[in-house]
């Protein structure tokens, strides 16, 4: 078989047309995705067969494998076929679409597999990530096939950047069936204990009647054996349990505890392990950062969350301005601390329909007999801006003034704008910004006051207009982090007797 162009890899332009030719000594055909696209087949005078595949108006979706193969392999010794891979870099196509069959990968043993996320451009950098994580995995990538390696029983996504846009592939799910006729589970009453407390582990086998348990644990390595107890839980199906109990744990008892179960009838075995940590004394540790300044919006609900690790379980208290907080009967404050794993806790303070008076200094304290931590932050209540007053006056000096007063938290910015053609404004004509350039026939004076009791800023801004020769729509817009408000007033020239 002779293919022109020979490839094995071509990069073609989007929207272009391209011709592929294949010839051989017997009828030949082009195949794409196990189908035969429309093509022109011919037989030359010298007995050579050929097929011409014309690709028109190429898009990224034309990226992929193209095969030329003998159309009728009867009587031919060889099942020779030529493979060509075409890339059509197309910024509108992120990852090439997959069939459902390609998104779910099933296996029974540890073997190399390919996660088939493919892009249209061989120059793109593609990375592989666990679906729940951000770290790129060190797995080799082939632009024609995808990522190949030995993968754990997880879900994965591929990422690339096209221009300044990050693109994610569909999720790929790796399912590994662990073929074992023994189903072993190991658990501990606690995986963290203080020295002097007890370690108790259980190893349970379901569905097997004749099994042998063998434990390995740190103490065993130093020759100090512990006799496990085996009992039967007469459930259906059969449950057999081995209990390993170590009283008065020492620091050296930290480590991996493994339960190995063998079944002699079919010579099957399985093992499970669990890690135990023995600590000198209890601990409380904060996890993650909580900024020293937190914000809440007036009349909205806000939950403040602190995550920490502790053993043994701690007492948690919340304070505001050094006074203890409790769940309020009016339902304005809700406190909750929940266990999200054996030693991890989330404590939440929820302020319902936040009020100005709830601004202040908050502290969470978690403690037990061995340790304590505390975390403090200032809570600022943000208040959306509102324009309280917009008035126009024309003192004897001949100039005209417009005064705008408003409040909000954080401090509002003020923007003055005007529109001269009342009929076309503001739909057709954008308003002109005022007071920020020397050319404007206007002057601006702005004062800001902080009102301690209301915990918000007041802005008063006065705009002086020198020559108003026709009616003018003047707009005052106040804006802060949580909103904006606008009012407008029509300013008419002195000479006009009415408003």
């Amino acid at each position: 078989l002779v293919v022109t162009p020979p490839g094995p890899e071509l990069v073609l332009n989007v929207s272009s047309t391209f011709v592929l030719t294949c010839s051989g000594s017997a009828p030949v055909v082009w195949e794409r995705m196990s189908q035969e696209p429309p093509q022109e087949m011919a037989k030359a005078q010298d007995g050579t067969f050929s097929s011409v595949l014309t690709l028109t108006n190429l898009t990224g979706l034309d990226t992929g494998e193209y095969f030329c193969t003998h159309n009728d392999s009867r009587g031919l010794e060889t099942d020779e076929r030529k493979r060509l891979y075409i890339f059509v870099p197309d910024p509108t196509v992120g990852f090439l679409p997959n069939d459902a069959e390609e998104l779910f990968i099933f296996l029974t043993e540890i073997t190399e597999i390919t996660i088939p996320c493919r892009v249209t451009d061989p120059q793109l950098v593609v990375t592989l990530h666990e679906k729940k994580g951000d770290v790129a995995l060190p797995v080799p990538y082939d632009h024609q096939r995808g990522f190949s390696g030995i993968f754990e029983d997880r879900s994965y996504i591929c990422k690339t950047t096209i221009g300044d846009r990050e693109v994610d592939s569909d999720a790929y799910y790796v399912y590994r069936l662990q073929v074992s006729s023994i189903n072993v589970s190991v658990n501990a009453v606690q995986t963290v204990v203080r020295q002097g407390e007890n370690i108790t582990l259980m190893c349970i086998v379901i569905g097997n009647e004749v099994v042998n348990f063998e434990w390995t644990y740190p103490r065993k390595e130093s020759g100090r054996l512990v006799e496990p107890v085996t009992d039967f839980l007469l459930d259906m199906p059969y449950h057999i349990r081995s209990i390993l109990h170590i009283p008065s744990a020492e620091l050296e008892d930290s480590g991996t505890y493994t339960c190995n179960v063998t079944e002699s009838v079919n010579d099957h075995q399985d093992e499970k392990a669990i890690n135990i940590t023995v600590v000198e004394s209890g601990y409380v540790r904060l996890l993650g950062e909580v900024g020293t300044l937190q914000f809440a919006e007036l009349h909205r609900s806000r939950t403040l969350q602190v995550v920490f690790e502790a053993y043994p379980p701690p007492t948690v208290l919340w304070f505001k301005d050094n006074r203890t907080l409790g769940d309020s009967s009016a339902g304005e404050i809700a406190l909750s601390t929940r266990n999200v794993s054996e030693t991890r806790y989330v404590s939440e303070l929820t302020l319902v329909r936040v009020k100005v008076a709830e601004a202040g200094h908050y502290t969470m304290r978690a403690f037990h007999e061995d340790a304590e931590v505390q975390l403090s932050f200032q809570l600022q209540i943000n208040v959306p801006v509102r324009v309280l007053e917009l008035s126009e006056s024309h003192p004897d000096s001949g100039e005209q003034t417009v005064r705008c007063r408003g409040r909000g938290m954080p401090q509002p910015n003020i923007i003055w704008s005007a529109c001269r053609d009342l009929k076309r404004c503001p739909r057709e004509l954008p308003p002109t910004l005022l007071g920020n350039s020397s050319e404007e026939e206007s002057q601006l004076e702005t004062n800001v006051t902080y009102w301690e009791e209301e915990q918000e800023f007041e802005v008063v801004s006065t705009l002086r207009l020198q020559h108003v020769d026709r009616p003018l729509s003047v707009r005052c817009t106040l804006r802060n982090a949580v909103g904006q408000d606008t009012q407008e007033v029509i300013v008419v020239p002195h000479s006009l007797p009415f408003k």
């Epitope: 099933f106 666990e130 679906k131 729940k132 029983d153 997880r154 879900s155 799910y173 790796v174 399912y175 590994r176 069936l177």
Partner: nanobody, 116 residues
């Protein structure tokens, strides 16, 4: 803990149909895709199809299209796989499986034997 429990073994004659059930527990049933996979003696795993119960629209592998029906019953948290026109090559252990994102969970398997 996610758990899948399948119906018991079946013996069928060629040309007949079989319906295997998979009851889910330990998670929000509607939110996770449930797959059906089979393993014939001495072979690897072969995907049959799957369903996301909240969408109710199943996906099928091309080679089983038209011969397999997968559906979900939210009231009992159960997914069913029915295969018709059985032939001897359909003798296999049929598994349902779901994925929690950080690992997969499997039913115990249902042996379907097709024999005259």
């Amino acid at each position: 803990q996610m758990q899948l429990v399948q119906s018991g073994a079946e013996v069928k004659k060629p040309g007949a149909s079989v319906k295997v059930s998979c009851k889910a527990s330990g998670y929000t049933f509607t939110d996770y895709y449930i797959q059906w996979v089979r393993q014939a003696p001495g072979q690897g795993l072969e995907w049959i199809g799957g369903i996301l119960p909240i969408l109710k629209t199943p996906n099928y592998a091309q080679r089983f299209q038209g011969r397999v029906t997968i559906n979900a019953d939210e009231s009992t948290s159960t997914v069913y796989m029915e295969m018709s026109s059985l032939r001897s090559e359909d003798t296999a252990v049929y598994y349902c499986a779901t994925h929690g994102g950080d690992r997969s969970y499997w039913g115990q398997g249902t042996l379907v034997t097709v024999s005259s």
